[in-house]
C-alpha cells in the first residue's frame, strides 16, 4: 500500500487533513498529548479504518472502545474506505486519559480523496485501475513481472514530414496516438477540493529528454492533445475539476535504452496543499508509474520472412530475377531500390538491419540505420521509415567508422539455452578483432553500447577482422531445421572443401575445372588447387580463424557439433593478409523460410553437376530446405560480396514477448 503523510493531532484545535484512498496515513498522537495523560482511545467515522499496533489493550472501556498506553512505540495508522462527499466529512476523535485529570479530546477532520495514476502495468494492452493492488513504482522482468511499457515513437505517420513522430510536439492523428502508451489519472474529490489543492504531473530532470506526455481532452479529437511534459517541460500543473474525473495522457519515449539511459522512466503525480497563500505548497501525496522503453529487437533467419529488399544496379537484372522468384516462393513482398536512389551502392545488408519494437498494445518494425553512409545512405530514412515503420541510428554520421560498422557484420542467433540460461530471443553476433592494435578494426563503441543496452539479446563478440571485408556473414549463417534446436549453424569450411576436392581427385576428376563457364575468368583445375602450397597455407590460417569462432559460438550459444553444418569454401589471403572468398561464398546466403538463395559457386562440374552445389544440397535438403543457386559472380562476388550482402529481409517478430524474459 502506498505511503501517505504523517498527521499530527493536537487537543488545542481541530486538525484538518487529506487522506488519499489506498494509502496508509500515520497518526502522531504522542507529540502533542497533554503532559499528565498516560493512555488514549480512538473513535472514528465508519469510513475510516484505524489500526493500532504494538502491545495488548491496557484496559477495556465500558463503552467497548479500548484504551492504549501513550507510548512512542504505539503506532496508529489510518486508511479510508470511501472518498468524501464534502470536505472534512470524516471524523476521528482521540481521547487522552490521565490518573488525575478528566479526558482531553483532540479532533481530526479527514477528507478522503481518490487519486490514482494508472498505466498498463499488467501488460495486457489495457489500462485497468490498480489502486492499492500493485506497486507501480517498480518494473520487473519475467512472466510474473509488472510494469508499463513505452515505445519510442520513431515512425513517421505523416508522409509529408521528413522527421520521426517523436521529433515534434504534436499528435498527428489516431495513428500517431496508437504508437503511444495510455496513462490515466482518476480523481474523486469533494467539489471544492481543488480550490485549496493542486495536482502536478512531473518527471525527473534526468529523464525529461527521454519522454513526452500529451494530455488528451476526453471525447474530443486527438488533435486536441497538448504536450504537458517533455524535453522542455519537467512538470505541469493540472487543471482538475472536483468530483469524479478521469484524465487521459498519451506517453511516447524519445530515446532507446543506451549506455547513459537504462530505459526506465518514472512519471509522478503530486498532490499539493495550496491552502495557505503565505506558505509554499506542501506535498500531501505522490503516486508514480514507472515505464520501461521497449528495446530494439533483431530477428534471426529462423523467423518467417515478410519483405525482401535488394538494389537494382547496372547489369544485375538476372540476379534480381532470381531474388524475385525466391521471394515469390516464400510469399514475401519485394522492394527494389532503383539505381538512381542507390548511387551504385548495392550492399543492402550493410546499410541497415530491420528489427522491431513491441508493447502489449502495438508492435512496430524498426530499421536500424548503420553509420556506413555510402550510396544507400538515404534509403532507410526516405524509403523504409514511414507509417508504422520506425527508424533508429547510432554512431558517427561522418567518418570515424570502419568496415566492421556495416551490418553484414551484425547478425542474431535463433533462440538458445546456454548452461541453463535462456535466451528466448537469441543472441546478437558481431565481428571484432581478436585484440586491439594500431590498425585493427572494431565495431564502433556507440553501436556496441546500443546493442548491449537493449538487454534482451546479449551480444557475443566474434572474430572477423581476419577478413578483408570483415563481416560475420562471410563465415556464418543460420537456417531453420525441423529437429534438435530448430536450426543449424552453417560455417564456411576450407577443410570440408579440401576433403571434397580430394575425394573428386581420388575418383579421377583432378582435371575438372573451377570457374568453368565464366567468361574472362581463369579456370582452375582441382589438381592445381590441391597442389598449391600457398593456398593450403592460407586456408589453414582461415580454418584456425573460423575454428576460433566455432568454439566461441558453441560456448556462447550452447551448441553441439551436431548443431553445426560445414559448408565447403576456400579463401585466399590478399593484401595485409586479409581473407577473401576464393569462389563465391556459399554461406553468404539469403534465407527465406525453407527457401535458400545461395551464391552459385561455379565449382568443378562432375557428371553434369557442380560438385560444390551437390555437396551443399546433400547437407541442407534433408532439413527440408530448398537450395537455389544464384549467379552473383560479376555483379557481387568480384566486388567483395555475395547474395546476403546484397539483400535484406524484414521478418515476423517473435511470438515470445520480450518482457517475459529475465535478462
Amino acid at each position: 500500500m502506498a505511503q501517505g503523510t504523517l498527521i499530527r493531532v493536537t487537543p488545542e484545535q481541530p486538525t484538518h487533513a487529506v487522506c488519499v484512498l489506498g494509502t496508509l496515513t500515520q497518526l502522531d498522537i504522542c507529540s502533542s498529548a497533554p503532559e499528565d495523560c498516560t493512555s488514549f482511545s480512538i473513535n472514528a467515522s465508519p469510513g475510516v479504518v484505524v489500526d493500532i499496533a504494538h502491545g495488548p489493550p491496557a484496559k477495556k472501556k465500558s463503552t467497548g472502545s479500548s484504551t492504549w498506553p501513550l507510548d512512542p512505540g504505539v503506532e496508529v495508522t489510518l486508511t479510508m474506505k470511501v472518498a468524501s462527499g464534502s470536505t472534512g466529512d470524516q471524523k476521528v476523535q482521540i481521547s487522552y486519559y490521565g490518573p488525575k485529570t478528566p479526558p482531553v479530546k483532540a479532533l481530526l477532520y479527514l477528507t478522503g480523496v481518490e487519486i490514482s495514476l494508472c498505466a498498463d502495468i499488467t501488460r495486457t494492452g489495457k489500462v485497468k485501475p490498480t489502486r492499492a493492488v500493485k506497486d507501480q513504482r517498480t518494473w520487473t522482468w519475467g512472466p510474473c513481472g509488472q510494469g508499463a511499457i513505452l515505445l519510442v515513437n520513431c515512425d513517421r505517420d505523416n508522409l509529408e514530414s521528413s522527421a520521426m513522430d517523436c521529433e515534434d510536439d504534436e499528435v498527428l492523428d489516431s495513428e500517431d496516438l496508437q504508437d503511444m502508451s495510455l496513462m490515466t489519472l482518476s480523481t474523486k474529490t469533494p467539489k471544492d477540493f481543488f480550490t485549496n489543492h493542486t495536482l502536478v504531473l512531473h518527471v525527473a530532470r534526468s529523464e525529461m529528454d527521454k519522454v513526452r506526455v500529451f494530455q488528451a481532452t476526453r471525447g474530443k479529437l486527438s488533435s486536441k492533445c497538448s504536450v504537458v511534459l517533455g524535453p522542455k517541460w519537467p512538470s505541469h500543473y493540472l487543471m482538475v475539476p472536483g468530483g469524479k474525473h478521469n484524465m487521459d495522457f498519451y506517453v511516447e519515449a524519445l530515446a532507446f535504452p543506451d549506455t547513459d539511459f537504462p530505459g526506465l522512466i518514472t512519471l509522478t503525480i503530486s498532490l499539493l496543499d495550496t491552502s495557505n497563500l503565505e506558505l509554499p505548497e506542501a506535498v500531501v501525496f505522490q503516486d508514480s508509474v514507472v515505464f520501461r522503453v521497449a528495446p530494439w529487437i533483431m530477428t534471426p533467419n529462423t523467423q518467417p520472412p515478410q519483405e525482401v529488399y535488394a538494389c537494382s544496379i547496372f547489369e544485375n537484372e538476372d540476379f534480381l530475377k532470381s531474388v524475385t522468384t525466391l521471394a515469390m516462393k516464400a510469399k514475401c513482398k519485394l522492394t527494389i531500390c532503383p539505381e538512381e536512389e542507390n548511387m551504385d551502392d548495392q550492399w543492402m545488408q550493410d546499410e541497415m538491419e530491420i528489427g522491431y519494437i513491441q508493447a502489449p498494445h502495438k508492435t512496430l518494425p524498426v530499421v536500424f540505420d548503420s553509420p556506413r553512409n555510402r550510396g544507400l545512405k538515404e534509403f532507410p530514412i526516405k524509403r523504409v521509415m514511414g507509417p508504422d515503420f520506425g527508424y533508429v541510428t547510432r554512431g558517427p554520421q561522418t567518418g570515424g567508422i570502419s568496415g566492421l560498422d556495416s551490418f553484414g557484420n551484425l547478425e542474431v542467433s535463433p533462440p538458445v539455452t546456454v548452461r541453463g540460461k535462456e535466451y528466448p530471443l537469441g543472441r546478437i553476433l558481431f565481428g571484432d578483432s581478436c585484440y586491439p592494435s594500431n590498425d585493427s578494426r572494431q565495431m564502433h563503441q556507440a553501436l556496441q553500447d546500443f546493442l548491449s543496452a537493449q538487454q534482451v539479446q546479449a551480444p557475443v563478440k566474434l572474430y572477423s577482422d581476419w577478413l578483408s571485408v570483415g563481416h560475420v556473414d562471410e563465415f556464418l549463417s543460420f537456417v531453420p531445421a525441423p529437429d534438435r534446436k530448430g536450426f543449424r549453424l552453417l560455417l564456411a569450411s576450407p577443410r570440408s572443401c579440401y576433403k571434397l576436392f580430394q575425394e573428386q581427385q581420388n575418383e579421377g576428376h583432378g582435371e575438372a575445372l573451377l570457374f568453368e563457364g565464366i567468361k574472362k575468368k581463369k579456370q582452375q583445375k582441382i589438381k592445381n588447387i590441391l597442389s598449391n602450397k600457398t593456398l593450403r597455407e592460407h586456408n589453414s590460417f582461415v580454418e584456425r580463424c573460423i575454428d576460433w569462432n566455432r568454439e566461441l559460438l558453441k560456448r556462447e550459444l550452447g551448441l553441439a557439433e551436431s548443431d553445426i553444418i560445414d559448408i565447403p569454401q576456400l579463401f585466399k589471403l590478399k593484401e595485409f593478409s586479409k581473407a577473401e572468398a576464393f569462389f563465391p561464398n556459399m554461406v553468404n546466403m539469403l534465407v527465406l523460410g525453407k527457401h535458400l538463395g545461395i551464391p552459385k559457386p561455379f565449382g568443378p562440374v562432375i557428371n553434369g553437376r557442380c560438385c560444390l552445389e551437390e555437396k551443399v544440397c546433400s547437407l541442407l535438403e534433408p532439413l527440408g530446405l530448398q537450395c537455389t543457386f544464384i549467379n552473383d559472380f560479376f555483379t557481387y562476388h568480384i566486388r567483395h560480396g555475395e547474395v546476403h550482402c546484397g539483400t535484406n529481409v524484414r521478418r515476423k517478430p517473435f511470438s515470445f514477448k520480450w518482457w517475459n524474459m529475465v535478462p
Epitope: 568496415g403 590498425d439 571485408v469
Partner: antibody, heavy 128, light 111 residues
Framework: QVQLVESGGGLVKPGGSLRLSCAAS????????VSWIRQAPGKGLEWVSF????????YYADSVRGRFTISRDNAKNTVYLQMNSLRAEDTAVYYC?????????????????????WGRGTLVTVSS | QSALTQPRSVSGSPGQSVTISCTGT?????????VSWYQQHPGKAPKLIIY???ERPSGVPDRFSGSKSGNTASLTISGLQAEDEADYYC???????????FGGGTKLTVL
C-alpha cells in the same frame, strides 16, 4: 590503365587541416588499391596510408596515425586524405598511387604493397 | 633514418652493371616476398620497375632484375644507359606497425 591526379595541396599553418583528393580517370577506381606516399623536399619516399579496393580497411604509418584519415568515394572515382593537426614535418609532395585488385592467380600477389600507377603529386607546405 | 638501408649512391659506366642493395630485417625483407623497386627522375613521380622481389611490370626493360637473399634484396641494372641515371628506392611489406617501408634511396650516377 587508370590515371591519377592529386589536388588540395597548399600552404597551411601548424595545427591546421587540409583534404587532398586523388581523382581517377581511364578506369574505375573501385578496382584499385590506393596508397598515399609523400616525399619531403630533398628527401626520400615515405609511405603514408593505404585503403583497399572494397573500402573495408585502411592502414597508416606511425607518423600520421590518429591525425590523417584515408577514405574513398567510388561513385566519384576519388580517394581522399584528410590531414588534421598538421606539423612542419608533414611538409612534402604527396603522391597518390594505385595497384589493380583484379587478379586471376590462385593466390593473389601483394599488389597492395607496391604502386604501379602514380599521380604527379601535390605540394603541402606547413609553416607559420 | 629510413627503415630499410640502401647505399647513398652508386655509379657505373655505360654498358656496365650495377647492383643496389636494400637491407631490412626478419620482419620485413626477410619475411615477405613483397619487395618492390622504384625509379625516380628529378622533378618526376616515381615509377615501379620491380615488384614481388623479381617481377617486372610490362614495359620495363629486362636489364632491370631483382633478387633477395635473407634480409637483403637487390636491384641489378645491366648494360647501364644514360637514362638510367636517377634515384632508386626499395620498399617492403613489414610486420611492424607501419606496414609498408621504404629505403632512404640510392642515387645512381652514370659516368
Amino acid at each position: 590503365q587508370v590515371q591519377l591526379v592529386e589536388s588540395g595541396g597548399g600552404l597551411v599553418k601548424p595545427g591546421g587541416s587540409l583534404r587532398l583528393s586523388c581523382a581517377a580517370s581511364g578506369s574505375t577506381l573501385s578496382d584499385y588499391f590506393v596508397s598515399w606516399i609523400r616525399q619531403a623536399p630533398g628527401k626520400g619516399l615515405e609511405w603514408v596510408s593505404f585503403i583497399n579496393a572494397a573500402n573495408t580497411f585502411t592502414y597508416y604509418a606511425d607518423s600520421v596515425r590518429g591525425r590523417f584519415t584515408i577514405s574513398r568515394d567510388n561513385a566519384k572515382n576519388t580517394v581522399y586524405l584528410q590531414m588534421n593537426s598538421l606539423r612542419a614535418e608533414d611538409t612534402a609532395v604527396y603522391y597518390c598511387s594505385s595497384a589493380n585488385d583484379d587478379v586471376d592467380d590462385i593466390v593473389a600477389p601483394g599488389r597492395g604493397y607496391y604502386m604501379d600507377v602514380w599521380g604527379r603529386g601535390t605540394l603541402v607546405t606547413v609553416s607559420s | 633514418q629510413s627503415a630499410l638501408t640502401q647505399p647513398r649512391s652508386v655509379s657505373g659506366s655505360p654498358g656496365q652493371s650495377v647492383t643496389i642493395s636494400c637491407t631490412g630485417t626478419r620482419g620485413d625483407v626477410g619475411r615477405y616476398n613483397h619487395v618492390s623497386w622504384y625509379q625516380q627522375h628529378p622533378g618526376k613521380a616515381p615509377k615501379l620497375i620491380i615488384y614481388n622481389v623479381y617481377e617486372r611490370p610490362s614495359g620495363v626493360p629486362d636489364r632491370f632484375s631483382g633478387s633477395k637473399s635473407g634480409n637483403t634484396a637487390s636491384l641489378t641494372i645491366s648494360g647501364l644507359q644514360a637514362e638510367d641515371e636517377a634515384d632508386y628506392y626499395c620498399s617492403s611489406h613489414s610486420r611492424s606497425s607501419t606496414p609498408v617501408l621504404f629505403g632512404g634511396g640510392t642515387k645512381l650516377t652514370v659516368l
